[in-house]
Interface confidence: medium
Amino acid sequence: EEELQVIQPEKSVSVAAGDSATLNCTVSSLIPVGPIQWFRGAGPGRELIYNLKEGHFPRVTAVSDPTKRNNMDFSIRISNITPADAGTYYCVKFRKGSPDVELKSGAGTELSVRAKPS
């Protein structure tokens, strides 16, 4: 059985303050069943950025329809970027359960924020 891969192709992304940032993430397999969540930072201090299952994440939209059958693209777009959004973002696969169990994280994409040109 091939090991699940969580692929974040870009190591870094740079956007101007006020613009939108696209953070790409794909998984190599639909198995095991379970959600994808996005975090900024790693370890216990990480921030939950997007969780399709629950919560309201007004500045984040899924690039592809995550509810579509056989979807393997879990890329997100964050709008109206500010300097406080800078950091490394991780796409993390969970196995469905009670609670869900973290399986594998992508390598991370570092978001840097440039001052908006005047």
Epitope: H56, R59, N80
Partner: antibody, heavy 119, light 108 residues
Framework: DVQLVESGGGVVRPGESLRLSCAAS????????MNWVRQAPGEGLEWVSR????????DYAESVKGRFTISRDNSENTLYLQMNSLRAEDTAVYYC????????????WGLGALVTVSS | ETVLTQSPATLSVSPGERATLSCRAS??????LAWHQQKPGQAPRLLIY???NRATGIPDRFSGSGSGTDFTLTISGLQTEDSAVYYC??????????FGGGTKVEIK
Amino acid sequence: DVQLVESGGGVVRPGESLRLSCAASGFSFSSYAMNWVRQAPGEGLEWVSRINSGGGGTDYAESVKGRFTISRDNSENTLYLQMNSLRAEDTAVYYCAKQYDWNGFFDYWGLGALVTVSS
Amino acid sequence: ETVLTQSPATLSVSPGERATLSCRASQTVGSKLAWHQQKPGQAPRLLIYDATNRATGIPDRFSGSGSGTDFTLTISGLQTEDSAVYYCQQYYYWPPYRFGGGTKVEIK
């Protein structure tokens, strides 16, 4: 409807401790960062502390750093503020406030809990 | 650290008139500015976010404008229940989160 209800306020002497609680309902508590904001009598609003959705990331105002500890229990939908080495200048109404997203404004506020530090 | 300066400190307006409140940031905060209303003895309530967007349930007599460093909250057709202190909050740079010193709106 989102509801935030603080409890645990009271009168203490300088140097003593107090723990505030904020019971949350009406939203997915574990998905949101939460904050404490205080207001001294007749004064404006002062941000005190923030905790991220998972509970592992915290920030504090310089005025309370090393004395106050913010924490949360996502299984109980409750936010806490442990206040040690209290000073007269900590006298205030303490509000818990929900954050709109991880990097955002405060969209819901509790009714507040009065903390009085007096000898 | 970003400092928010609100003016005037107190504003006295007759019912039905327009109230204009100012909030100035010491450095750009983009559009990341919110306005909160606090009535006497009550908790603050969110009015405006991202400089111009009204929060859920807020009457359309409240409007926000501005970006960068200069922001305005306008209350058109002031009603007696609008008597309150109004605070601006920036969330472009943090921590710490910063509030302005407040503007007290009194009804003449």
